[in-house]
């Protein structure tokens, strides 16, 4: 395996709670700044599997606002602009990392948490179960 | 904004870096458990805007492995199984939080970082620019 030497300038880890509790710098570095991603802001309307975005707000979590996608239809929009129920609109899910205040209401103490979010929808061919 | 009363049992915040540096409990709590068990999907193959998944690994980041979606086609798959270039396959992107070791190779000091990931693809009607 790749052996990583320990940096001699590392913070002290004598804390009795180490390694469960560590220091995290919240000055967020944004790796996306120089890239120019195509704006996906109107895909939710232009998609053949359009979705609505629901605001999920939790002041005890960072980020406190997460937008959840909910597919508008069971089927997909066809070329005529009608819903085709021979196809299915399904949510694309992703597990993400968030910080939760712990104990609650503490401004500088958090716990890592994984949550599952729906990011958008895609149109798929349905799985047809044939009854013998 | 929502005012949150400060919990009297909160850790001390006298650190000169506060509130930039906070304590984080790394024993990850999984909010998805039981309420929302994960169900495997092959949407990436069954979608009208199918995608491939590329493994992005960085041992200095948590999560170390992130799977990036890349749309297989510029167009979308039609009912005949052919690519229809009158429609566009586009990536659905999401900004996620990751933890990065800082300084590098330190086991107990991290910085939050935002990165943009492509989670999957969706089929959209193209924006047609008419030349006068």
């Amino acid at each position: 395996g790749i052996t990583i030497p320990r940096n001699p300038g590392c913070p002290n880890s004598e804390d009795k709670n180490f390694p469960r509790t560590v220091m995290v710098n919240l000055n967020i570095h944004n790796r996306n700044t120089n890239t120019n991603p195509k704006r996906s802001s109107d895909y939710y309307n232009r998609s053949t599997s359009p979705w609505n975005l629901h605001r999920n707000e939790d002041p005890e979590r960072y980020p406190s606002v997460i937008w959840e996608a909910k597919c508008r239809h069971l089927g997909c929009i066809n070329a005529d602009g009608n819903v085709d129920y021979h196809m299915n609109s399904v949510p694309i899910q992703q597990e993400i990392l968030v910080l939760r205040r712990e104990p609650p209401h503490c401004p500088n103490s958090f716990r890592l948490e994984k949550i599952l979010v729906s990011v958008g929808c895609t149109c798929v061919t349905p799985i047809v179960h044939h009854v013998a | 904004g929502i005012t949150i009363p400060r919990n009297p049992g909160c850790p001390n915040s006298e650190d000169k870096n506060f509130p930039r540096t906070v304590m984080v409990n790394l024993n990850i709590h999984n909010r998805n458990t039981n309420t929302n068990p994960k169900r495997s999907s092959d949407y990436y193959n069954r979608s009208t805007s199918p995608w491939n998944l590329h493994r992005n690994e960085d041992p200095e980041r948590y999560p170390s492995v992130i799977w990036e979606a890349k749309c297989r086609h510029l167009g979308c798959i039609n009912a005949d199984g052919n690519v229809d270039y009158h429609m566009n396959s586009v990536p659905i992107q999401q900004e996620i939080l990751v933890l990065r070791r800082e300084p590098p190779h330190c086991p107990n000091s991290f910085r939050l970082e935002k990165i943009l990931v492509s989670v999957g693809c969706t089929c959209v009607t193209p924006i047609v620019h008419h030349v006068a």
Partner: antibody
Framework: EVQLVQSGAEVKKPGESLKISCKAS????????IVWVRQAPGQGLEWMGG????????DYAQKFQGRVTITADESTTTAYMELSGLTSDDTAVYYC???????????????????WGQGTTVTVSS | EIVLTQSPDFQSVTPKEKVTITCRAS??????LHWYQQKPDQSPKLLIK???SSTSGVPSRFSGSGSGTDFTLTINGLEAEDAGTYYC?????????FGQGTKVDIK
């Protein structure tokens, strides 16, 4: 290809402690987790606990809480499992296994144990 | 904790025969069920992950299906080398648990 090589067989007396090592090679050690699973003679598999090697966070089965300690040393790419207060019921083969530790995205995710060590036989007898 | 119950406990099968092992979870675990094969005096080996995803290097005769609480491991055309004990394992919630195992031997 990931390989996990465990330390050799141990014979212990009741009340003693045990520390088994699991040396990983191949892949990046901090990118995955290590779990410990044991198997008593003629019995099934039992999950004891695991560690997220990236930052040393641990999870333990309630049954072993307070008796088991799992650690990892990134510099040597080795995980350890220490079990104290041994009794004859702890006689078993102890396995370490890799937990891919990937975030769920519909198809790839964590907690299927895809590579296993060869096992360490532990006998507890007075 | 989530209890996994496998059936049967034991199966004696002739080569080329089809083998079906079931695993029932005490609550909904979605697709978070994995199957392992353990041969005598060997470490377990991952066969199927996430209920139905095959693992590289595993023969195509092994397949998995199911979701929720009921899962099946199928060996289509058993071979002599397939003798061993098969375990299911859930990773939905801690503590991770295994089924009691199904021993398959060759007639």
């Amino acid at each position: 290809e990931v390989q996990l090589v465990q330390s050799g067989a141990e014979v212990k007396k009741p009340g003693e402690s045990l520390k088994i090592s699991c040396k990983a090679s191949g892949g990046s050690f901090s990118s995955y987790g290590i779990v410990w699973v044991r198997q008593a003679p003629g019995q099934g598999l039992e999950w004891m606990g695991g560690i997220t090697t990236f930052f040393g966070a641990t999870d333990y089965a309630q049954k072993f809480q307070g008796r088991v300690t799992i650690t990892a040393d990134e510099s040597t790419t080795t995980a350890y499992m220490e079990l104290s207060g041994l009794t004859s019921d702890d006689t078993a083969v102890y396995y370490c296994a890799r937990d891919p530790n990937e975030f769920w995205n519909g198809y790839y995710a964590t907690h299927d144990f895809d590579y296993w060590g060869q096992g360490t036989t532990v006998t507890v007898s007075s | 904790e989530i209890v996994l119950t496998q059936s049967p406990d034991f199966q004696s099968v002739t080569p080329k025969e089809k083998v079906t092992i079931t695993c029932r979870a005490s609550q909904d675990i979605g697709s978070e069920l994995h199957w392992y094969q353990q041969k005598p005096d060997q470490s377990p080996k991952l066969l199927i992950k996430y209920a139905s995803s095959s693992t590289s290097g595993v023969p195509s005769r092994f397949s998995g299906s199911g979701s929720g609480t009921d899962f099946t491991l199928t060996i289509n055309g058993l071979e002599a080398e397939d003798a061993g004990t098969y375990y299911c394992h859930q990773s939905t919630s801690l503590p991770y648990t295994f089924g009691q195992g199904t021993k398959v031997d060759i007639k």
